[in-house]
Interface confidence: medium
């Protein structure tokens, strides 16, 4: 049986916790990073879709992020296998209601940070 | 755009006490982990400690040198940080820097002199 | 706990040479929080790189960051008039929380 932290929803053997408020994505995996946690990796369409249906409309951060010219990258450094399209010209990326997109890593949204859930 | 806003150093004597203040301006400064580093003339930067937004609990944590005589505090209401400066040393002395916790934004720093 | 140490303390070049400043971690520390930093003469400290990597918003391509592990290096490609200034490496996290910064490199005009 999953178990997850307190406030963290359980979903395919990953705990992820969703944000009330707003940071930059540089202060939202601070945050994640102080809970042993990163900002969400996405890793399949169904944990996209999870993530797309409960999180509300709001904007959430993730854990892509690109230098200039470079490809996408998760947190932990493995490249993005393009599992589903991100819009827009920004170095950090985030779900809104349609599906991912990407900002400046300087504005402020909510987020989602990820880790893997405990099994007891 | 962001600004943080440092007034409050000054002139104090060993043993003295001396409160900093940083206003800060175009982010959600409630949301926002906030640190204070410093520089002695001369030398490099050092981190003093920093404080979590109260929603995620608000805690402090300090640098060795500082503990049990500095507190930082805030006032959300205010946007306003503080550094609150108990038994002042001479090795003290130094511009103080508000910072954003993720250090992309800076004060101008104020001057802290502690001497007799 | 981690210290920073930079290498060479005074860098002497002339305007439109390469700078290559070395930034050396006693432990393996995470690229996501090693940033490096610009101070001029009275005043506060600017950010250029974070992540190791990324620039900073207004950074100019000339400087670039690059490294993992524990050995981590800014670049200047083509120097200007206005870089000459003392440069900061810093590793910031939360394990410990607060941040430590590496002790300086002078960039001079040589």
């Known amino acids: 049986q999953a178990a997850c932290p307190e406030s963290w929803i359980g979903f395919q053997r990953k705990c992820f916790y969703f944000s009330d408020d707003t940071k930059n994505w540089t202060s939202s995996q601070r945050f994640c990073d102080s809970q042993d946690a990163d900002l969400a990796q996405v890793e399949s369409f169904q944990e996209l879709n999870f993530l797309l249906r409960y999180k509300g409309p709001s904007d959430h951060w993730i854990g892509l992020s690109r230098e200039q010219g470079q490809p996408w990258k998760w947190i932990n450094g493995t490249e993005w296998t393009r599992q589903f399209p991100i819009l827009g010209a920004g170095e950090c990326a985030y779900l809104n209601d349609k599906g991912a997109s990407s900002a400046r890593h300087y504005t402020e949204r909510k987020w989602i940070c990820s880790k893997s859930d405990i099994h007891v | 755009q962001v600004q943080l806003v440092q007034s409050g150093g000054g002139l104090v004597k060993p043993g003295g006490s001396l409160r900093l203040s940083c206003a800060a301006s175009?982010?959600?400064?409630?949301?926002?982990?906030m640190s204070w580093v410093r520089q002695a003339p001369g030398k490099g930067l050092e981190w003093v400690g920093r404080i979590k937004s109260k929603t995620d609990g608000g805690t402090t944590d300090y640098a060795a040198p500082v503990k049990g005589r500095f507190t930082i505090s805030r006032d959300d209401s205010k946007n306003t940080l503080y550094l609150q400066m108990n038994s002042l040393k001479t090795e003290d002395t130094a511009v103080y820097y508000c910072?954003?916790?993720?250090?992309?934004?800076w004060g101008q720093g104020t001057l802290v002199t502690v001497s007799s | 706990e981690t210290t920073l140490t930079q290498s060479p303390g005074t860098l002497s070049l002339s305007p439109g040479e390469r700078a290559t400043l070395s930034c050396r971690a006693s432990?393996?520390?995470?690229?996501?929080?090693l940033a490096w930093y610009q101070q001029k003469p009275g005043q506060a400290p600017r950010l250029l790189i974070y992540g190791a990597s990324t620039r900073a918003t207004g950074i100019p391509d000339r400087f670039s960051g690059s490294g993992s592990g524990t050995d981590f290096t800014l670049s200047i490609s083509r120097l200007e008039p206005e870089d000459f200034a003392v440069y900061y490496c810093?590793?910031?996290?939360?394990?410990?929380?607060?941040?430590?910064f590496g002790q300086g490199t002078r960039l001079e005009i040589k």
């Open positions: 910072t954003t916790d993720e250090y992309f934004y």
């Open positions: 432990q393996s520390i995470s690229s996501t929080y």
């Open positions: 810093q590793q910031y996290g939360n394990s410990p929380p607060g941040a430590t």
């Open positions: 175009g982010f959600t400064f409630s949301n926002a982990w």
